[in-house]
Interface confidence: low
């Protein structure tokens, strides 16, 4: 609901005449840029030459709103672009999985106080790249070969580990047969069971496998680190507060 109100307010701001007379700021943009189809590109604008406070930045493609970065509410990506648009870096915008249809003008609209609105223009051209296609033709068989090699290696390792365990199990069985019979009623730990409490293999924020060989403390730190990253990425946009 608040985003609906914000969008209405933003449109109003866009059409409103500037209240202040003198605008000293300039917008620096990445200018005219080109990128390959299927790739990604960062659109960046920077407002300089002014001490005005930025309250909101709108990113628009022709007449479509892509995203809003509001000082209080943070980022909002337009639902129709959610899958392909990522906020940042900074007040910039990252466009992913580019198509030829993405070719065109992009605008960064800075709403500032007391200056008013500044607009920067970027022209993006998305190219059909024969080089990219040529590279892909070589990459696919290569990836296939690598994957096959990996599967063979993993299979070999699993077989060796299984045989080693079998031998150990036979030795243990012959020596400790009586003990095993005595404790047959007790539940045995199985490798498929969830990791015991305190284990960090299941730390949601950290990528799987990073903590396999590490001590608990290290993994806790890593978990915290990734939580900090996700917290920062969910935070408000980077708007300035004058501290001088």
């Amino acid at each position: 609901m608040r985003w609906c109100l914000l969008l209405i307010w933003a449109q109003g701001l866009r059409q409103a005449p500037l209240a202040s007379g003198m605008m000293t700021g300039t917008i620096e943009t990445t200018g005219n840029i080109s990128a390959e189809k299927g790739g990604s590109i960062i659109l960046q604008c920077h407002l300089s030459s002014t001490t005005a406070q930025v309250t909101q930045v709108n990113w628009e493609q022709q007449d479509q709103l892509l995203a809003i970065c509001n000082a209080d509410l943070g980022w909002h990506i337009s639902p129709s672009f959610k899958d392909r648009v990522a906020p940042g870096p900074g007040l910039g915008l990252t466009l992913q999985s580019l198509t030829v249809n993405d070719t065109g003008e992009y605008f960064c609209i800075y709403h500032t106080y007391p200056d008013g609105t500044y607009t920067g223009r970027i022209f993006l051209e998305v190219l059909e790249s024969s080089v990219a296609e040529h590279g892909a033709r070589f990459q696919i068989p290569l990836l296939g070969a690598m994957a096959a090699t990996l599967v063979v290696i993993c299979t070999a390792v699993i077989v060796v580990v299984a045989l080693t365990r079998k031998k150990k199990a036979l030795r243990i069985h012959s020596v400790e047969g009586d003990l095993r019979r005595k404790s047959a009623g007790q539940e045995e730990w199985s490798p498929s069971a969830p990791s015991p409490p305190g284990s960090c293999v299941q730390a949601e924020a950290a990528p799987a496998g990073l903590c396999g060989e590490q001590r608990g403390e290290d993994c806790a730190e890593l978990h915290d680190y990734f939580n900090v990253l996700s917290y920062r990425s969910l935070g408000n946009c980077s708007f300035f507060t004058e501290t001088g």
């Epitope: 300089s48 900074g90 935070g235 300035f240 507060t241």
Partner: nanobody, 118 residues
Framework: EVQLVESGGGLVQPGGSLRLSCAAS????????MGWFRQAPGKEREFVAS???????FYADSVKGRFTISADNSKNTAYLQMNSLKPEDTAVYYC????????????WGQGTLVTVSS
């Protein structure tokens, strides 16, 4: 913690030169926009010059051709070379950095006083 420390200010005669330095710490200097602003007694703070991450420079009309902004990424320091100084350049000069971190954008130094007088 972001820190900006200006130095190089002082008293200089009209037509003279000064070089201001801004030592930065607590952030990735090479990916941050840097600028110089100034505030004369009884006036509002105004833009002087800036250098973007791509190396593009901007100048206020009043200092164009006389002042030069530069940055040394290896030393995490921004500079403002001021030549042909005029009495109207007298002000406290502030270094500013736009840091993409948390909810703070523009960070300011404490300022260094430049006095142009005979």
């Amino acid at each position: 913690e972001v820190q900006l420390v200006e130095s190089g200010g002082g008293l200089v005669q009209p037509g003279g030169s000064l070089r201001l330095s801004c030592a930065a710490s607590g952030f990735t200097f090479s990916t941050s926009w840097m600028g110089w602003f100034r505030q004369a007694p009884g006036k509002e703070r105004e833009f002087v010059a800036s250098i973007s991450t791509s190396g593009n420079t901007f100048y206020a009309d009043s200092v164009k051709g006389r002042f030069t902004i530069s940055a040394d990424n290896s030393k995490n320091t921004a500079y403002l070379q001021m030549n042909s100084l005029k009495p109207e350049d007298t002000a406290v000069y502030y270094c500013a950095a736009d840091v993409w971190y948390g909810s703070t954008w523009r960070n300011w130094g404490q300022g260094t006083l430049v006095t142009v007088s005979s």
